[in-house]
């Protein structure tokens, strides 16, 4: 049993990070193998990590952690029985990807303005909460070419557009996702999709 | 919220032991190593002993080594230390504290064990 | 075991004023990432000591930002940019780089 892909990781900077790998062959990841990590500070033990499968010879682990901080690094030790496979470390300050945000709404009953609320994915003691930035991704269901991303560059989890900048009378799709720039983190996954019926009244032309 | 309580603390003889505990809450208490430290009477603090989170790993200062004893009940969520052969330069508050990243995270509002014939 | 020295050991404030409390270690406490193993805590009249600042300069949770660490190797500051009335006590440096863990004397800030 070998190690194809070494396992990477990603933190969300709250309370899990996330760490995947291939192995050489088909592996019941979760009866098979451990992942122990253990956070490099004195009396600090190592915790074990059963892993899941993702796809056949894939294998994913949740590692529960503490609020992030930029000094924490931890050992990974991926072991098949006492068989160690792969060692490595991991800095979750390092790779972070944050939380998908929660929550989408789309207000439609503001004048013939659209507004869009999400909620923030982290509690605002959490260094993340006042970094975030936002990509909202809109979509039209009947026609594939009407796809739009607006970047929310603000703190305010919302935005605003007219209706019109949307055909009428149809129906559109949003999702959000997040970033944070002070950590150079990935996207977030997308958040859950949310519907509407897009419909404004025309303005009246003037002759 | 993480909370520590310690109980236990009273009034002893010298040459006498006690059984002081702390019971833990708001937090995983398997993850955590935890802690004993002191402060007699007008006096700065003092580490006793420590323990791991499995509670396989036992710490002691050297002054406490062989009449202290630590250990913890992870099922019952909470913290031990044993102290026999008690002495009068023993009389103090003992706190326990959880640890992260090397230092002491939260503290318990201490326990006094006092002493005196 | 290291030796944790702490100066000075009494400290009259004013408030508004800026306070400085010093610590240093008988041996490095700067660890190979960078990190120094270093907490300060603040015992209030009565109270439990609480967890200042860790790994040197870093602020715990909840604690007000007027308060800062810095230093590095065996030299270490604990800065009250303004002090307020709330932050009398003691103050005590303690190393976290072995067992045993070792405390400063503690530094007593009081209101001129």
């Known amino acids: 049993m070998k190690v194809l892909q070494e396992p990477t990781c990603v933190s969300d900077y709250m309370s899990i990070s996330t760490c995947e790998w291939k192995m050489n062959g088909p592996t019941n990841c979760s009866t098979e193998l451990r992942l122990l990590y253990q956070l490099v500070f004195l009396l600090s033990e190592a915790h074990t990590c059963i892993p899941e499968n993702n796809g056949g010879a894939g294998c994913v682990c949740h590692l529960l952690m503490d609020d992030v901080v930029s000094a924490d690094n931890y050992t990974l030790d991926l072991w098949a029985g006492q068989q160690l496979l792969w060692k490595g470390s991991f800095k979750p300050s390092e790779h972070v990807k944050p939380r998908a945000p929660g929550n989408l709404t789309v207000h439609t009953n503001v004048s013939d303005t659209l507004l869009l609320t999400w909620s923030n994915p982290y509690p605002p003691d959490n260094y993340l909460y006042n970094h975030l930035t936002y990509a909202v991704n809109i979509w039209s269901e009947n026609d594939p070419a009407d796809f739009r991303i607006y970047n929310v560059t603000y703190l305010e989890p919302s935005l605003r557009i007219a209706a019109s900048t949307l055909k009428s009378g149809i129906s559109y799709r949003a999702r959000v996702r997040a970033w944070a720039q002070c950590y150079n983190t990935t996207w977030s996954e997308w958040s859950p999709s949310t519907k509407w019926h897009n419909s404004y009244r025309e303005p009246f032309e003037q002759h | 919220e993480v909370q520590l309580v310690e109980s236990g603390g009273g009034l002893v003889q010298p040459g006498g032991s006690l059984r002081l505990s702390c019971a833990a809450s708001g937090f995983t208490f398997t993850r955590y190593a935890m802690t004993w430290v002191r402060q007699a009477p007008g006096k700065g603090l003092e580490w006793v002993s420590a323990?791991?989170?499995?509670?396989?790993?036992?710490y002691y200062a050297d002054s406490f080594k062989g009449r202290f004893t630590i250990s913890r009940d992870n099922s019952k969520n909470t913290l031990y230390l044993q102290l026999n052969s008690l002495r009068a330069e023993d009389t103090a508050v003992y706190y326990c504290?959880?640890?992260?990243?090397?230092?002491?995270?939260?503290w318990g509002q201490g326990t006094l064990v006092t002493v005196s014939s | 075991d290291i030796v944790m020295t702490q100066s000075p050991l009494s400290l009259p404030v004013t408030p508004g004023e800026p306070a400085s409390i010093s610590c240093k270690s008988s041996?490095?406490?700067?660890?190979?990432?960078?990190?120094?193993?270093l907490d300060w805590y603040l015992q209030k009249p009565g109270q439990s000591p609480q967890l200042l600042i860790y790994l040197g300069s870093f602020t715990a949770k909840g604690v007000p930002d007027r308060f800062s660490g810095s230093g590095s190797g065996t030299d270490f500051t604990l800065k009250i940019s303004r002090v307020e009335a709330e932050d009398v006590g003691i103050y005590y440096c303690?190393?976290?780089?072995?067992?045993?863990?070792?405390f400063g004397g503690g530094t007593k800030v009081e209101i001129k």
């Open positions: 041996q490095s406490l700067l660890e190979g990432q960078g990190y120094n193993r």
């Open positions: 303690m190393h976290t780089v072995q067992t045993p863990l070792t």
């Open positions: 323990i791991g989170g499995s509670g396989g790993r036992t």
């Open positions: 504290a959880r640890h992260l990243r090397g230092g002491l995270w939260n």
